[in-house]
């Protein structure tokens, strides 16, 4: 039995007058109906309309509307389609060619795309092939002359060169934009260390320990600072190019004027900080003036901060100068900061530098110095020695070398010495000693000791100090002096008086105003006693005020 055909559901198209015709379905084999296709679709004959036929096997054609693809939908960079047709129907293939030096993703000079149900199968791609690159201080490890996308080319450095941080081999990859990088090797001495730090700024990337030549690092400034110069530095021959500077863009804060104030400063304070270009009147304290020499002026906010930078300059008065053995000839009595004044020394006197005149400067805290006129040093008197130079007068800090006569020495085998001209004259006398006049260690004393570490040899006029043990009294000079090979008389350490409870009980007495069981008194000290309760004096009243004499005390007695 012949199957009838149901109403045809045409994808991407439809029957003409389909509403009227729908009523007459199903239809018998042999029936034909006109139909049309939607935009971008055509009948198998290539027309926008045709007939659909009911056959024994169903509707024919089975796919009434075929997809079309337009040549204009193809975007091809670095390539072209040579075919003249502008419309392609479903499953139709078109060839495209790549420009010289470019290839398909598979590495071919041409490719094809197919018109599919949803449009072209793919967008044609023509990408650059990679040729053998130019090697710098290196060589390729393979022989190929051109390379497809994603191909890897290994290379090695010549002796004494490295690719990066100690590596002598590396690889480059052929990418869509050519080789991933150039096969370059560097002389390691051309590497750079971390880029230099800058004030009020920093690098945008974390600094590395080593950078290859031509590495670039970027800087940025902190808030309120402006970058001046190139923001990049480049590594070249082991050194970085000049880094930028960060210049302050800050507005001006309230000016703290040393030795002066803004007029109406309390009223003005809330309006700070202020922009550059603003000016304010100010005044200076006593003994200070503005740079123009007035007691008031204007202070200006500039890109670099307040101007003048030192608004109030110190003034110095001539009356503050004390000059002994010299004089100031200038008539002016007031001098401002950094002003210099000349002074002269009387004949026979000189400045600390040995000149007849000098200068002092008015500084922030007053005069730079008090002028000094000091006496020159004349040739000194030599003792058992002679000068090694001929000058007759010597400036401050001048050195005069001298030598001892035969058989004499300065100290411990030295036979030459130097003296220095100081503000108080020569540092010491140029004296030499007969070696027999030296002393050995100073003598020991009972109940005392020297205060210094003892030497084996002391030159004449050496001094050594003694001290006594606790409660012992030093009698005589606490110093001994070496003279003619002998020490002067050392001091004595005089015994203290020890007042014991035992001695007081024997005499029925006690210390007046003290409850000590044991009491120490130095020679010459007075010790006051009194009778114990229930006892009466058996010796004179005077004996109760006993005097300590070199460790001995006469006790009073009570019965």
């Amino acid at each position: 039995e012949v199957k009838p055909c149901d109403f045809p559901e045409i994808q991407h198209g439809g029957l003409y007058y389909k509403s009227l015709r729908r009523l007459y379905f199903p239809a018998a084999a042999g029936q034909s109906y006109s139909y049309y296709c939607d935009q971008n679709f055509v009948t198998p004959s290539g027309s926008y309309w045709d007939y659909i036929h009911c056959t024994q096997d169903g509707w024919s054609p089975t796919v009434p509307c075929l997809r079309t693809c337009s040549k204009s939908d193809v975007e091809i960079e670095n390539g072209f389609i040579s075919e003249s047709s502008s419309i392609y129907i479903l499953n139709e293939e078109t060839q495209y060619n790549c420009k010289p030096g470019y290839a398909t993703a598979e590495g071919n000079s041409s490719g094809s795309i197919t018109c599919l149900q949803n449009g072209w199968s793919t967008q044609p791609i023509c990408i650059k092939f990679c040729d053998m690159p130019v090697f710098e201080n290196s060589r390729a490890k393979s022989n190929g002359m051109w390379f497809k996308l994603h191909d890897t080319l290994d290379y090695e450095c010549y002796d004494g060169y490295e690719s990066s941080y100690g590596n002598t081999t590396d690889s480059i990859v052929c990418g869509e934009d050519g080789w991933s990088h150039l096969p370059t090797c560097y002389n390691s001495s051309e590497n750079c260390g971390p880029p230099p730090p800058i004030s009020n700024g920093d690098t945008t990337s974390f600094p590395q320990k080593v950078y290859l030549p031509w590495s670039r690092v970027e800087y940025q400034c902190q808030s309120y600072y402006e970058l001046q110069g190139s923001k990049y530095v480049t590594c070249s021959n082991g050194d970085w190019s000049e880094p930028p500077r960060c210049i302050s863009m800050k507005p001006c804060e309230f000016p703290e004027i040393q030795h002066g104030h803004l007029y109406y400063e309390n009223t003005r304070r809330p309006y700070f900080p202020v922009a550059t270009g603003q000016s304010y009147s100010y005044y200076c304290d006593q003994n200070f003036v503005t740079p123009s020499g007035s007691y008031w002026d204007y202070i200006h906010c500039t890109q670099d901060g307040w101007l003048p930078t030192v608004p109030c300059l110190r003034t110095c008065s001539k009356s503050d100068i004390e000059i002994e053995n010299g004089f100031i000839s200038e008539s002016s009595s007031i001098y401002i900061l950094n002003k210099e004044i000349q002074y002269k020394c009387k004949p026979g006197y000189a400045t600390a530098d040995g000149n007849s005149s000098g200068s002092i400067t008015c500084l922030q805290n007053g005069w730079s110095a008090q002028p000094i006129c000091i006496k020159f040093c004349d040739m000194p008197v030599f003792e058992n020695s002679r000068a090694k130079s001929n000058g007759m007068r010597f400036k401050l800090h001048d050195t005069l070398d001298y030598e001892c006569y035969d058989g004499y020495e300065i100290s411990y085998g030295n036979t030459t010495g130097s003296i220095v001209c100081g503000e108080d004259g020569w540092s010491h006398f140029p004296t030499c000693y007969n070696s027999s006049e030296k002393c050995g260690p100073p003598p020991p004393i009972s109940n005392g000791d020297t205060t210094s570490f003892l030497l084996k040899v002391y030159v004449p006029q050496s001094r050594v100090e003694y001290q006594c043990q606790s409660y012992y009294e030093l009698q005589g000079s606490n110093y001994v002096t070496c003279s003619n090979g002998e020490w002067s008389e050392p001091p004595r350490c005089i015994h203290p008086c020890i007042i014991t409870e035992e001695n007081m009980n024997k005499n029925n007495i006690q210390l007046k105003g003290k409850s000590d069981i044991k009491y120490y008194a130095k020679t010459g000290d007075t010790i006051e006693f009194m009778c114990k309760l229930g006892y009466n004096a058996n010796t004179s009243v005077l004996s109760f005020q006993a005097v300590c004499r070199e460790g001995i005390v006469e006790y009073p007695r009570c019965e």
Partner: antibody
């Protein structure tokens, strides 16, 4: 050729007094020399105790000064060391020594005794 | 008190080699008052160098001293078998006289 010889008890009780003598032979104790005492605990370094000159002048190590007495006997040509209130930390080899004479205010020690071992133990 | 620090603690060398011993002071020492001593087991110290660089009587010229301020050196130019011992530096210019901890020169 000057020679030095230490002598004294090899065992001292804790809190007791260590007494040593150094006999000088081949030269006089009255020369221009400091006569010194040193010690060396077993397996450790050297420590200076103090010194005496023929006039009786002395220098002592401040860390031991309160416990040390150094004296000399010119008639016997010898000098002595007394160390009070000893503890086991005072166990050591004790050396006497003499400094050189070079004309300098201080000199190094060129002549040493062979040393004597003193043990502090009950 | 001047503290003297010697380094190294031990030096392992062969006869004929050069030995360099260091002595560092905690504060400046007058070079007139620095000495070096040699001590062998069971023996008293023996003076080698005084005044930082002067050899004591009878000391072979293979021993030499140098230095000033806080850094001093004892050099033995060619070690002989009898030179293997402990070496101490000492200052003797002020109180208390002190020694370094010693450097042991041993046969490698």
């Amino acid at each position: 050729q000057v020679q030095l010889q230490e002598s004294g008890p090899g065992l001292v009780k804790p809190s007791g007094t260590l007494s040593l003598t150094c006999a000088v032979s081949g030269g006089s104790i009255s020369g221009s020399h400091w006569w010194s005492w040193f010690r060396q605990p077993p397996g450790k370094g050297l420590e200076w105790i103090g010194e005496i000159y023929h006039t009786g002048s002395t220098n002592k190590n401040p860390s031991l000064k309160s416990r040390v007495t150094i004296s000399l006997d010119k008639s016997k040509n010898q000098f002595s060391l007394r160390l009070r209130s000893v503890t086991d930390a005072d166990t050591a080899v004790y050396y006497c020594a003499r400094d050189q004479y070079t004309g300098s205010p201080r000199d190094a020690f060129d002549i040493w005794g062979q040393g004597t071992m003193v043990t502090v133990s009950s | 008190e001047i503290v003297l620090t010697q380094s190294p603690g031990t030096l392992s060398l062969s006869p004929g080699e050069r030995a360099t011993l260091s002595c560092r002071a905690s504060q400046s020492v007058s070079s007139s008052y620095l000495a070096w001593y040699q001590q062998k087991p069971g023996q008293a110290p023996r003076l080698l160098i005084y005044g930082a660089s002067s050899r004591a009587t009878g000391i072979p010229d293979r021993f030499s001293g140098s230095g000033s301020g806080t850094d001093f050196t004892l050099t033995i130019s060619r070690l002989e078998p009898e030179d293997f011992a402990v070496y101490y530096c000492q200052h003797y210019g002020n109180s208390p006289l002190t020694f370094g901890g010693g450097t042991k020169v041993e046969i490698k």
